[in-house]
């Protein structure tokens, strides 16, 4: 579909005569009839197959025809067609004299014709005007013409229909050749497919309008490339949705159990050394001068009972001082001015002379001690219970009440799954609250480091479901990078999402 446009520019009839040579009275009031038809080698009369058009009287004798298109007038003349433009045409332009106001062919005398021109040729669709001039013995006509496509028609023959749109069915404008040109943010054959936010994950994200990234279930983040861990997962991550893989130092199904209390809470005070001993369990090894479960108590220098023979100890800033009872002297009241004659031994102790009677020594009965057998034995004084165990006096004996995770007479033994050295080939054993874990040296693997592995851990193709295998050069083990939809250390398990979970 298109329009053949004819622009009449100038008509010259200086003598004001008709084609017959007879002059017009009073002058030649001139109008034009145009016939457009298919190509003929010799243009002959007959139907105007492409269309006809007539003008009103445009002038008398010689005149210029002004461009009247802007004012809604009839120049250029429009000859619309509703078919594919064939690229060739024939054109007949007749100039007529109108004696009266009726311009119909039947109302005119046959000799009212002033001039007739006929041309034919090829004409391509385009915006450029072709200028032509036709001269006869008495008249001259200057004109130009072109063929353009109707609105929404494109291509060399105006045969390609394209109507720009921006709705659910497409988002495009039309190129000069009639092909679609998508509006920014749209793609696809009919520009119906939005271009998502740059970087939006192909599988895990989608969009309904340009520059958007909406996440499919189980994924989150601006680009939908972060999986959502299992609801309730505390100190864990995921590689596929709804997993919960514990961070270092955490255990339990939801990674909410502290396996590294020392690092996470630093419970030991005053520079003490902390050792993890299971879930929420630890042991502090105190520096000299400190005691208590968390080494929070400062030991007094008098706690070691340095004063002998019943001397009383007084703490001082720079140490301690012994106040000796009568008959004793020295830094620790260790020297006596008494002899066995003074009956210095208490609680049934036996006195023995020393240095020819200048000194003595007491031999104490059970449960008493001291230079003069003056002290009842407190078997807990020496803090014999290790690892924070509580010492209990039981008459002549004592016993240790151990903290969880320890055993033995003095709580010196750590109850440990690692005690039986389960890790082979020099593997390092780690106690966990709910089991043990072996860290294997290079060249070994397996739950207990019992499997000798080759240097290229991927040589045996251990990964399933087209997963990519990587060799960890530091441990000679392999890591499987699973494709979407598979999990497991070897990517052997397809992911299944239970319908009973709301997420």
């Amino acid at each position: 579909s298109g329009v053949f446009q004819l622009q009449l520019q100038e008509f010259i009839n200086e003598r004001g005569v008709l084609a017959s040579g007879r002059p017009c009275e009073p002058g030649c009031r001139t109008f034009f009839r145009v016939c457009l038809k298919h190509f003929q080698a010799v243009v002959s009369p007959g139907p105007c197959t492409f269309g006809t058009v007539s003008t009103p009287v445009l002038g008398t004798n010689s005149f210029a025809v002004r461009d009247d298109s802007s004012g809604g007038g009839r120049n250029p003349l429009q000859l619309p067609f509703n078919f594919t433009w064939p690229g060739t045409f024939s054109l007949i332009i007749e100039a007529w004299h109108a004696p009266g106001d009726d311009l119909r062919p039947e109302a005119l005398p046959p000799d009212a014709l002033i001039s007739k021109i006929a041309i034919q040729g090829s004409l391509a669709v385009g915006q450029n005007w072709l200028l032509d001039e036709q001269t006869s013995t008495l008249t001259r006509l200057r004109y130009s013409y072109r063929v353009i496509c109707s609105d929404n028609y494109y291509g060399d023959n105006c045969s390609r229909l394209c109507k720009k749109r921006n709705d659910h069915f497409g988002h495009y404008v039309c190129q000069p050749d009639g092909n679609l040109s998508c509006l920014p943010g749209w793609t696809g054959e009919y520009c119906q497919q939005p271009i998502c936010l740059s970087g939006c994950h192909e599988q895990n994200g989608y969009c309904s309008k340009p520059a958007e990234c909406l996440c499919r279930p189980g994924w989150q983040g601006r680009l939908c490339n972060e999986c959502i861990p299992h609801n309730g997962c505390r100190h864990g991550t995921c590689s596929t949705p709804w997993q919960c893989t514990c961070d270092e130092g955490w255990g339990g199904l939801f990674c909410d159990q502290d396996l590294n209390y020392c690092t996470h809470h630093s419970p030991c005070k005053n520079g003490a050394t902390c050792s993890n001993s299971g879930q929420r369990s630890y042991t502090c090894t105190c520096r000299p001068g400190y005691t208590g479960v968390d080494c929070e108590l400062e030991l007094s220098e008098c706690d070691s009972n340095p004063c002998r023979n019943g001397g009383s100890c007084k703490d001082q800033e720079d140490g301690y001082h012994c106040l000796c009872p009568p008959g004793y002297y020295g830094l620790h009241c260790e020297h006596s001015t008494l002899s066995c004659a003074d009956s210095p031994c208490f609680n049934g102790g036996s006195c023995r002379e020393r240095n020819q009677g200048a000194n003595y020594a007491c031999e104490c009965p059970p449960n008493f001690t001291g230079s003069n057998c003056e002290k009842k034995v407190d078997r807990c004084t020496s803090n014999p219970c290790a690892n924070g165990g509580q010492c209990l006096n039981r008459g002549p004996s004592r016993m240790c009440r151990c903290r969880p995770g320890f055993t033995g007479t003095y709580c010196e033994l750590h109850v440990s799954d690692c005690a039986r050295n389960p890790c082979a080939h020099g593997g390092t054993c780690h106690d966990l609250e709910n089991g043990l874990m072996c860290t294997c040296p290079a060249g070994f693997s397996g739950r207990r480091c019992e499997v000798r592995t080759s240097i290229d851990a991927c040589a045996s193709s251990p990964c399933f479901n087209r997963a990519t295998c990587y060799t960890d050069l530091s441990t000679d083990t392999f890591v499987c990078n699973c494709p979407y939809g598979f999990v497991g250390s070897r990517c052997e398990f397809p992911v299944g999402l239970p319908p009973s979970f709301p997420w």
Epitope: H230, C233, G236, Q243, C244, T245, C246, W250, G251, G252, L253, F254, C255, D417, L432, E433, N434, G435, L436, M437, R447, V487, G488, S489, E492, F493, G496
Partner: nanobody, 120 residues
């Protein structure tokens, strides 16, 4: 394909007992730790306890300690949750799960769940 199927749920009176079973398939059963968690309507899931791959190590949440016991029969590829002295607050859907490793550290697979209702 890893599959965990729970059974044994139902309605029980306060103070009563119930034993849940979890039948496993699709993996080497004695390589993986197995645990139980539960979820009451409108609440976050709560880990109940777990048993290591060998069965030598178990742990329990404080809320069920002394009342619930987890055991496993590697010959039958089954884990059990024995629940005694049940309380109304134990009402939930109970799921068995595995981290996919020998120690109880996380969740990678879980079953469809079985409903336990404690009510008089």
């Amino acid at each position: 394909e890893v599959q965990l199927v729970e059974s044994g749920g139902g309605l029980v009176q306060p103070g009563g007992s119930l034993r849940l079973s979890c039948a496993a398939s699709g993996f080497t059963f004695d390589d993986y730790a197995i645990g139980w968690f539960r979820q009451a309507p409108g609440k976050e899931p709560e880990g109940i306890g777990c048993i290591s791959s060998s069965g030598g190590s178990t742990y329990y949440a404080d809320s069920v300690k002394g009342r619930f016991t987890i055991s496993r029969d590697n010959a039958k590829n089954t884990v059990y949750l024995q629940m005694n002295s049940l309380k109304p607050e134990d009402t939930a859907v109970y799921y068995c799960a595995t981290p996919g490793i020998a120690a109880c550290r996380g969740i990678h697979y879980w079953g469809q769940g079985t409903q336990v209702t404690v009510s008089s």
